[in-house]
């Protein structure tokens, strides 16, 4: 503890000049103080001061009233500083004294003599008010004050506690009446060490050096740290914990730039025709009748679904067709017949039979004719029998189909399974296509049958096709295939269009 | 009982970087309570303060030393380095890591045994 | 720069009481540490925030600080506390050491 004992003396009064021996001063009493203070005792007795002691200059003769005076010989207050915990009590001699010599230092003159001299006990709380008293015997009469205070940076009841303010990484903060931290604006912590951060400012994911401050952790962004921050080169997700890359509606792929719903995001087909998506950024338009065109963008002609018939030739006009009739032939689809079978309109041995009471008649064609009057000859290709790419023969009265390779069966309509002799080696998985079988290799391997162990590199090889992207140690000792627009697959083998169940996401 | 342990090479050559690591065992660097800091002492002389750092990575230097010094921390490995640019015969000290306390009001409670290095080509 | 002055040296027989300044601007209103160093030895923290002795330092080793200068005061002092004595405030942000006192135990 450290605080300082403060006696401030305002009048002394020895009106007759008189010494403490009866004896009176020539020409008059030059007076200074002696003070002492010391621990409380019950009776004062002689022996050390052992809270302090302190001697005044001359301070007037007789009776004087002293100044306040804060430096220099003859400071008043007086002060008597200790450095220990203020035990609260004390005892307090105040002696006056007369003496011959120097007024400045009397204490060290020969001949001085006693005045007179006051004893105070008692308690003394610390504090900054002045306690006054005034003590009078048969000759003199003081007046004076006092009071205990805490040195700077010492602080309550009994100045024990040491606090300076401070500003700097070690403490924020300055000290209240009792000693106790009052931490400056934006610090807190028992030791107003501790920035206050920004508010709002994630507890976990944030933190700051200075207050008002939001210093996101890795893998988290904004101005609270509160969002997270997705996989780089996420295009179309989002995340919920950092590095994530969950993908948007209608959106795949590793890093979600894959367009799995084209066709609500583009609206690329036309005129009314409906859109089938069909993998990433795949879709198919099914156009309305009298469009064509991959987005059905292509208006077909009036007359492309042949409606004429009984040999009429279609012109087309602005919304709409007209049908030019042969003779014998009438209506807006030249359907009417105007002939009978005295007209015999059957041609290539057709027999003709009378309908309506003779007023129009029916052709009943031999084989291999056809036609409402047996003119044409049977194409048996028209109707296109053969599937899965066969083409159609004509063999005299019937026809052929030539299967492509991997198909068999009258209309071409088998398919022979590539993957029946398991071409796919180490557990590759076999997928039959148009070209020919196709193997998705299990991790470790590569090559189109799966052939190839991957000891190094992954990508070393070049297994993605159609222009992928290939990235490694995104899954152990595996790659992915990052597909281009209209590719999808683990390698990025498959061209979009196959049916939507197949397989695609690596 | 937290213990310090400087690491680095005795010797640099003179331009080139002196790079020393503090590793900090019986307690974690990720207390809110400390700094750790770095003092040098040519050979002879007295105490330098270098600077210091907490675990969230606020620095504080030496002015007369700011443009040379930089001090980082490690918290998965409970180590802070040192790194001093541009070093010339005068950097020739021993370096000592050490623990200030907030609750010391930034006094070291805790020294490592310091690391002699010397400067010379 | 802030700067902190000690005397070079200090001389006491044994059992009495040596005393160690460190004088700086306005000292009084900054925390001082003081800090023991014996041969080839690290430092080791004797005084924290002027008077306050950490655990394990005798009670022979006491501090006060006002005004323009700190003192460590060491009373009965014994061979064993022979070394060099440096003290420390911050200045800002910034730790500034005394030039030491090197105590002789005669």
């Known amino acids: 503890g450290s605080g300082i004992f403060q006696l401030r003396l305002q009048e002394f009064v020895n009106q007759r000049g008189m010494l403490a021996n009866g004896q009176s001063c020539e020409p008059g009493c030059r007076t200074f103080f002696r003070i002492c203070l010391k621990h409380f005792q019950a009776t004062f007795s002689e022996g050390p001061c052992t809270f302090g002691n302190v001697s005044t200059p001359v301070l007037g003769t007789n009776s004087f009233v002293v100044r306040d005076k804060n430096s220099g010989s003859g400071r008043n207050p007086l002060q008597l500083p200790f450095n220990f915990t203020w035990p609260g009590t004390f005892s307090l001699n105040i002696q006056a004294w007369h003496t011959p010599g120097d007024d400045l230092r009397p204490e060290t003159s020969p001949g001085n003599s006693l005045i007179s001299q006051i004893i105070i006990q008692g308690s003394l709380a610390v504090g900054k008010i002045w306690r006054t008293d005034e003590q009078n015997d048969t000759l003199t009469r003081l007046s004076y004050s006092y009071r205990v205070i805490c040195s700077d940076n010492y602080y309550g009841e009994s100045c024990s506690r040491l606090c300076k303010k401070r500003d700097d990484h070690f403490g924020h903060y300055e000290c209240q009446p009792d000693g106790s931290l009052s931490c400056l604006p934006g610090w807190t912590g028992k030791y107003c060490d501790q920035p206050i951060c920004l508010s709002g400012c994630h507890e976990q994911n944030g933190y700051c050096s200075k207050p008002d401050e939001c210093i996101c952790r890795p893998g988290w962004q904004g101005r609270l740290c509160n969002e997270c921050i997705p996989h780089n080169g996420c295009r179309h997700g989002t995340c919920s914990i950092p590095w994530q890359c969950a993908c948007d509606e209608g959106w795949g792929g590793l890093f979600c730039d894959q367009d799995l719903n084209y066709c609500t995001h583009h609206s690329p087909c036309k005129n009314g025709s409906t859109c089938s998506n069909s993998g990433p950024k795949g879709y198919t338009c099914t156009c309305l009748p009298g469009y064509t065109g991959e987005h059905c963008e292509l208006g077909l002609s009036k007359c492309a679904s042949n409606p004429c018939r009984n040999g009429g030739s279609c012109k087309d006009q602005e919304n709409s067709y007209h049908c030019l009739c042969p003779p014998g032939y009438y209506g807006q689809h030249c359907e009417h017949s105007t002939l009978t079978c005295a007209d015999s309109p059957c041609f290539n041995g057709g027999s003709c039979r009378e309908r309506n009471q003779g007023s129009s008649y029916a052709c009943e064609c031999p084989p291999n004719f056809t036609g409402s009057n047996c003119e044409k000859k049977v194409d048996r290709c028209t109707s296109n029998p053969c599937a899965n790419g066969g083409q159609c023969q004509n063999r005299g009265p019937s026809r052929t189909c030539r299967c492509r390779p991997g198909f068999t069966g009258t209309h071409c309509e088998l398919h022979i399974s590539d993957c029946a002799r398991s071409p796919c080696a180490h557990g590759g998985t076999c997928h039959d296509l148009e070209n020919g079988p196709v193997c998705t290799c299990p991790a470790g391997f590569s090559g189109r049958r799966c052939e190839v162990r991957i000891t190094h590199d992954a990508c070393a090889s070049g297994p993605c096709f159609n222009g992928a992207t290939c990235y490694t140690g995104l899954s152990p000792n595996n790659f992915v295939c990052n597909c281009p627009y209209g590719f999808v697959g683990s390698r990025c083998e498959f061209p979009v269009g196959l049916p939507p169940s197949f397989p695609w996401v690596a | 009982e937290v213990q310090l342990q400087e690491s680095g090479p005795g010797l640099v050559k003179p331009s080139e970087t002196l790079s020393l690591t503090c590793t900090v065992s019986g307690g974690s660097i990720s207390s809110g309570s400390y700094y750790w800091g770095w003092i040098r002492q040519p050979p002879g002389k007295g105490l330098e303060w270098i600077g210091d750092i907490n675990y969230i990575g606020s620095t504080y230097y030496n002015p007369s030393l700011k443009s040379r010094v930089t001090i980082s921390v490690d918290t998965s490995k409970n180590q802070f380095s040192l790194k001093l640019s541009s070093v010339t015969a005068a950097d020739t000290a021993v370096y000592y890591c050490?623990?200030?306390?907030?609750?010391f009001g930034g006094g070291a409670d805790s020294w490592g045994q310091g690391t002699l290095v010397t400067v010379s080509s | 720069s802030y700067e902190l002055t000690q005397p070079p040296s200090v001389s006491v027989s044994p059992g009495q009481t040596a005393s160690i300044t460190c004088s700086g601007d306005?000292?009084?209103?900054?925390?001082v540490s003081w800090y023991q160093q014996k041969p080839g030895q690290s430092p080791v923290l004797v005084i924290y925030e002027d008077s306050q002795r950490p655990s394990g330092i005798p009670e022979r080793f006491s501090g006060s600080n006002s005004g323009d200068t700190a003192t460590l005061t060491i009373s009965g002092t014994q061979a064993m506390d022979e070394a060099d004595y440096y003290c420390?405030?911050?200045?800002?942000?910034?730790?500034?050491f005394g030039s030491g006192t090197k105590v002789t135990v005669l």
């Open positions: 306005r000292l009084g209103d900054k925390y």
């Open positions: 420390q405030a911050w200045d800002m942000e910034a730790g500034v």
């Open positions: 050490a623990r200030e306390a907030v609750s």
